[in-house]
Structures are given as structure tokens and as C-alpha cells.
């Protein structure tokens, strides 16, 4: 039962970990400007995110802007919009993995090979994890070391975004979610059944055995 | 308008120490980032240390670290560049700068001290 | 250290004219990079900082580019008041440092 559990754990975490990355991805709030200095009449909030970036007035009007020209923009920023893209379209590939892997079970009568999709999917998810703390980590870097740079103008220098902490819990959550399933699945196949989740037909197994003899956790 | 008026250059002989200030008017002294830059001779701009708008944080290239100390006091808008065992490639005109709120880098120049090491 | 090599060192141009100044840093330094123009007998003034900003007040004709590590500066339409002494300097990371200058004049 446990192992199941740590599997449907490591999907529902996993699942909350894209969800998290695509707010991240999609929220122009990576770098956060707070203009309150003495040569800003109006204080204003600016958001700068992948895509947008989004001027805040005091009064609580907003205005974003896409920005315009793809070529034209820093090359952090292209790459770490490919980079949340990329990372994203990994777990997307993760998780079609891991749904091969439960619906194998039923057509595939060697019960290594879902064990084995299971593990992939884990790796994969890990993967896009990785993928995700890469663009968050730089950028977050970047704005330290603005920050403590004495020739940076305090009104280039920028605050971490509520993105990039949704970023970072996207990661955790994808890298914690694709361990827990790279964990469920046993180092060797001398293990029994017990140690997958499978959804089994309703005709007698080869071998019949007792009802106790059965692992509860077998059944969805 | 931003003022800076550097004194204290001069002659000096090599192992020497001398102290550079410089007067800052025209704006609030206490919110900026301070620096000082040297030209030598040969024109070449060489930075040599840089001051947090408090004065906690001070920063030095290794060709000064232990020998220049920069200080400021900002209740006599005051800056103030401590300078010993001077060496002959110390020779240059020293800079007192202002950063900016807006800008990066050295964005205000005074007119400059010339030091001279020499024998 | 961070190497800013910076050429031409002497440039001679005539009024009207378009002229460019490059300076190239030893390795990475982002868009951290201002340029100076000290006219003789003057202390240095700001014209661009972030590569590409320009300072308010420095004529449009000046601009700033960057290219990976190869940074630029461009006058178009070249005017006397423009004979001077451009250097480029990063501030990317500690000791910054200055290109060695370019001593710009008029033909």
C-alpha cells in the first residue's frame, strides 16, 4: 500500500509542480521594480516577466506590455523562456509516460515493463525539474549580484519576482514528485508484484493463489 | 548642479602617504554611491575604489587593496581617499565621482587632483 | 581580470561622417558596459551605460550596441564638438576596468 501511496504521491506532486511552473512561466513577475525614489513623482510598481512586462500605478491602474520583437530581446531572457517551455513540455512528456506505464499493465503481461515506464516517467519529471530551476536560479543570481554591484543605478535594480518562488516550488515539487517515483520502483527485477500498482483483469491468474496471498494495494 | 572639488594632490616620494578629499555640493550626499578613478599619464583610466552611500561597504581592486582606504563622512559631505606606500605607478589624476540614481556607472566627474610620485 | 580591448586608438573623420568605436571584453559581461567621452582638458562624462542607454542630454546621434561580447559605440552625422577621448568600461563584476581609449578627431 505504501508504495502505491508514494506513487500517487509523486504524480500529485509532479502534477502541482507543472501547474506551478506554467504560473511561473506565464506571470510577468520575475523582476519586481519599486520606483519610489526621489526623481519618480508617481510611485509605480514594474513587473518584468518572459513575455510582459506590466507598469503598476499607486492609483492600481496596470498596463502591460508584450514585448515586441523576439530577436530583439537579451539572450538570458531567450533562453530562459526556451528553457520554461522546454521544461514544461518534459513533464508534459513525463506524465504520457507514466500513463503509458499504468495502461501497459493491461496489455503487457511482464510486470517489469510498467516499473520500468514508472522509473522513466520519475527520470523525466527530475529532468524537467533541473530544467526548471535553471532560467529561476539565473535569474535570481542576476538580480543579487545587481543588487550588490555599487555601479548598478538603484533604479535598474530589481526585487525576486513572485514568479521566481513559484519557480522554485515548481522545481522542488517536480524533482520531489519525479523521486518519489524513481523510489517506487525496485533496483532489480527479482521483486515481486507488490512493488507495482496494476490494474488486473477479472480472469484467474495463471498460478491461482489464496485471496491473502493477494497485496490490497494491487487493486485500483 | 553637482559639485566635486578634489584636494590634497601633490609631490610625494615613493613609500609615501598622502589623503585626497573631496568637497561635494549641490545634492544630497548621504544617498550615493562614491567612487574614485585615476588617469595616468598615458591616459589611461584605472578604477580605484568605490563607497556604499553609508560607508558600510567598500570596494577595491587588488592593485590598491591594503594600501588605499576610502572614507566618507556625510555630515560634512565630505569623501576622503587615504593613500600609503605610494608607488611610482601611483602617478595619475585622481577623480572624485558621483553614481546616480537613474544612471550606471560614473555618472559625475569632478575636475581631478594630480599625484605625483616621484624622487 | 575582465580585458576591455578597445580600437581603434585614434580615429580621424570629417564632419558628417559616421564613425564607430568597438570594444571587446575577455569574457562575458552581459549589457555592463558604459562609455565616457573626456574632451581635452576636461574630466570624463557619461554618455551611455547598460550598452545601449543613452544619458539625458547626450545628443540622439550617439548610440550604443552590443553583440555577445563586442560592444559598440556609433556617431552618426559627426560634429566638431565631438573631438575627444571615448572609453568603454564594465562594471560587471570587480575591478572594473576601462578600455584603453580612442582618441577621435576631425580631418
Known amino acids: 500500500m505504501a508504495s502505491a501511496g508514494m506513487q500517487i504521491l509523486g504524480v500529485v506532486l509532479t502534477l502541482l509542480g507543472w501547474v506551478n511552473g506554467l504560473v511561473s512561466c506565464a506571470l510577468p513577475m520575475w523582476k519586481v521594480t519599486a520606483f519610489i525614489g526621489n526623481s519618480i513623482v508617481v510611485a509605480q510598481v514594474v513587473w518584468e516577466g518572459l513575455w510582459m512586462s506590466c507598469v503598476v500605478q499607486s492609483t492600481g491602474q496596470m498596463q502591460c506590455k508584450v514585448y515586441d520583437s523576439l530577436l530583439a530581446l537579451p539572450q538570458d531572457l531567450q533562453a530562459a523562456r526556451a528553457l520554461c517551455v522546454i521544461a514544461l513540455l518534459v513533464a508534459l512528456f513525463g506524465l504520457l509516460v507514466y500513463l503509458a506505464g499504468a495502461k501497459c499493465t493491461t496489455c503487457v503481461e511482464e510486470k517489469d515493463s510498467k516499473a520500468r515506464l514508472v522509473l522513466t516517467s520519475g527520470i523525466v519529471f527530475v529532468i524537467s525539474g533541473v530544467l526548471t530551476l535553471i532560467p529561476v536560479c539565473w535569474t535570481a543570481h542576476a538580480i543579487i549580484r545587481d543588487f550588490y554591484n555599487p555601479l548598478v543605478a538603484e533604479a535598474q535594480k530589481r526585487e525576486l519576482g513572485a514568479s521566481l518562488y513559484l519557480g522554485w516550488a515548481a522545481s522542488g515539487l517536480l524533482l520531489l514528485g519525479g523521486g518519489l517515483l524513481c523510489c517506487t520502483c525496485p533496483s532489480g527485477g527479482s521483486q515481486g508484484p507488490s512493488h507495482y500498482m496494476a490494474r488486473y483483469s477479472t480472469s484467474a491468474p495463471a498460478i491461482s493463489r489464496g485471496p491473502s496471498e493477494y497485496p490490497t494495494k494491487n487493486y485500483v | 548642479e553637482v559639485k566635486l572639488v578634489e584636494s590634497g594632490g601633490g609631490l610625494v616620494k615613493p613609500g609615501g602617504s598622502l589623503k585626497l578629499s573631496c568637497a561635494a555640493s549641490?545634492?544630497?550626499?548621504?544617498?550615493?554611491?562614491m567612487s574614485w578613478v585615476r588617469q595616468t599619464p598615458a591616459k589611461r583610466l584605472e578604477w580605484v575604489v568605490t563607497i556604499s552611500s553609508g560607508g558600510g561597504r567598500t570596494y577595491y581592486p587588488d592593485s590598491v587593496k591594503g594600501r588605499f582606504t576610502i572614507s566618507r563622512d556625510n555630515a560634512r559631505n565630505t569623501l576622503y581617499l587615504q593613500m600609503s606606500s605610494l608607488r611610482s605607478e601611483d602617478t595619475a589624476m585622481y577623480y572624485c565621482i558621483r553614481g546616480d540614481y537613474r544612471y550606471d556607472g560614473f555618472a559625475y566627474w569632478g575636475q581631478g587632483t594630480l599625484v605625483t610620485v616621484s624622487t | 581580470d575582465i580585458q576591455m580591448t578597445q580600437s581603434p586608438a585614434s580615429l580621424s573623420a570629417s564632419v558628417g561622417e559616421t564613425v564607430t568605436i568597438t570594444c571587446r571584453a575577455s569574457e562575458n559581461i552581459d549589457s555592463y558596459l558604459a562609455w565616457y567621452q573626456q574632451k581635452q582638458g576636461k574630466s570624463p562624462q557619461l554618455l551611455v551605460y547598460a550598452s545601449t542607454l543613452l544619458v539625458d542630454g547626450v545628443p540622439s546621434r550617439f548610440s550604443g550596441s552590443r553583440s555577445g561580447t563586442q560592444f559598440s559605440l556609433k556617431i552618426n552625422s559627426l560634429q566638431s564638438e565631438d573631438v575627444a577621448r571615448y572609453y568603454c568600461?564594465?562594471?560587471?563584476?570587480?575591478?572594473?576596468?576601462f578600455g584603453s581609449g580612442t582618441k577621435l578627431e576631425i580631418k
Open positions: 568600461q564594465h562594471y560587471y563584476s570587480i575591478p572594473y576596468t
Open positions: 549641490g545634492f544630497t550626499f548621504n544617498v550615493y554611491t
